[in-house]
């Protein structure tokens, strides 16, 4: 499926505090996101 | 496909409770922030709710106009979000979307009336 | 609360001319890192919100490139270069930095 959401910006956390503080973490928690990473398995064990 | 789909809206009286559901599908669930946002019969949108994920412990945030009478919450095996509904209000008539931001759902319609 | 306020609150438009929607918000919405927490809906008739813009001038997949989105920190623009009859309908900008999230009262395109 096509991603309405890009994620040039995958780094970007939300810091809850003061509201100057606070970041549009929404794209990375999207669901375009979602489908782009997919449920991310555990590492095979060695 | 994504797919959104409220349930659980309808008729209540002033002071009634309802519980919305929304299920969802077509995409991994568990690391998605979901939201409320309602819109009143020929008004504009309204956010009302958030929840974010199990990894930001399920934090939730509301608008003051909702706030002590509604309640937001997930349950992640059942990839569905809820809204409860507590002391309704006859201004809390609207229809109420599920949404990530990206995608919404086709809404359901609560009536608060006597 | 951040007031989002646009102009105007009505739009006719002409098939093919260009058209455009201001947006400007109470406080600044531009964070820390660079990314400006301005998106666009479109809501057409009977139907529910449709995401056209985020973070001021991305265009969401599957949204026609005639959309473009533009601004500073408070103030901001949506710009159809060739007006559709499928465009009809209500426009809103929202802004998803400060709690509680708020949208703009929305502006009705409609064709003259």
């Known amino acids: 499926l096509a991603d309405p959401l890009d994620h040039r910006d995958a780094g970007d956390l939300w810091f809850p505090g003061e509201s100057e503080s606070f970041e549009d973490a929404h794209v990375e928690h999207s669901i375009s996101r979602s489908l782009l990473e997919g449920e991310i398995p555990f590492p095979p064990t060695s | 496909e994504v797919q959104l789909v409220e349930s659980g809206g309808g008729l209540v009286q002033p002071g009634g409770s309802l519980k919305l559901s929304c299920a969802t599908s077509?995409?991994?669930?568990?690391?998605?922030?979901m939201h409320w946002v309602r819109q009143a019969s020929g008004k504009g949108l309204e956010w009302i709710a958030h929840?974010?994920?199990?990894?930001?412990?399920?934090?939730?945030y509301y608008a003051e106009s909702v706030k002590g009478r509604f309640t937001i919450s997930r349950d992640d095996s059942k990839t569905t979000i809820y809204l409860q509904m507590n002391s309704l209000k006859t201004e809390d008539t609207a229809v109420y979307y599920c949404?990530?931001?990206?995608?919404w759902g086709q809404g359901t319609t609560v009536t608060v009336s006597s | 609360d951040v007031v989002m306020t646009q102009s105007p609150l009505s739009l006719p438009v002409t098939p093919g001319e260009p058209a455009s929607i201001s947006c400007r918000s109470s406080?600044?919405?531009?964070?820390?890192?660079?990314?400006?927490?301005l998106y666009w809906y479109l809501q057409k008739p009977g139907q529910s919100p449709q995401l056209l813009i985020y973070?001021?001038?991305n265009l969401a997949s599957g949204v026609p490139d005639r959309f473009s989105g533009s601004g500073s920190g408070t103030d901001f623009t949506l710009k159809i270069s060739r007006v559709e009859a499928e465009d009809v309908g209500v426009y809103y900008c929202?802004?998803?930095?400060?709690?509680?999230?708020?949208f703009g009262p929305g502006t009705k395109v409609e064709i003259k």
């Open positions: 077509g995409f991994p669930f568990s690391n998605v922030w």
């Open positions: 406080r600044s919405l531009l964070t820390s890192k660079g990314i400006t927490s």
């Open positions: 929840i974010k994920a199990k990894s930001d412990n399920y934090a939730t």
């Open positions: 973070r001021m001038s």
């Open positions: 929202a802004q998803f930095l400060v709690y509680p999230y708020t």
């Open positions: 949404t990530g931001l990206d995608y």
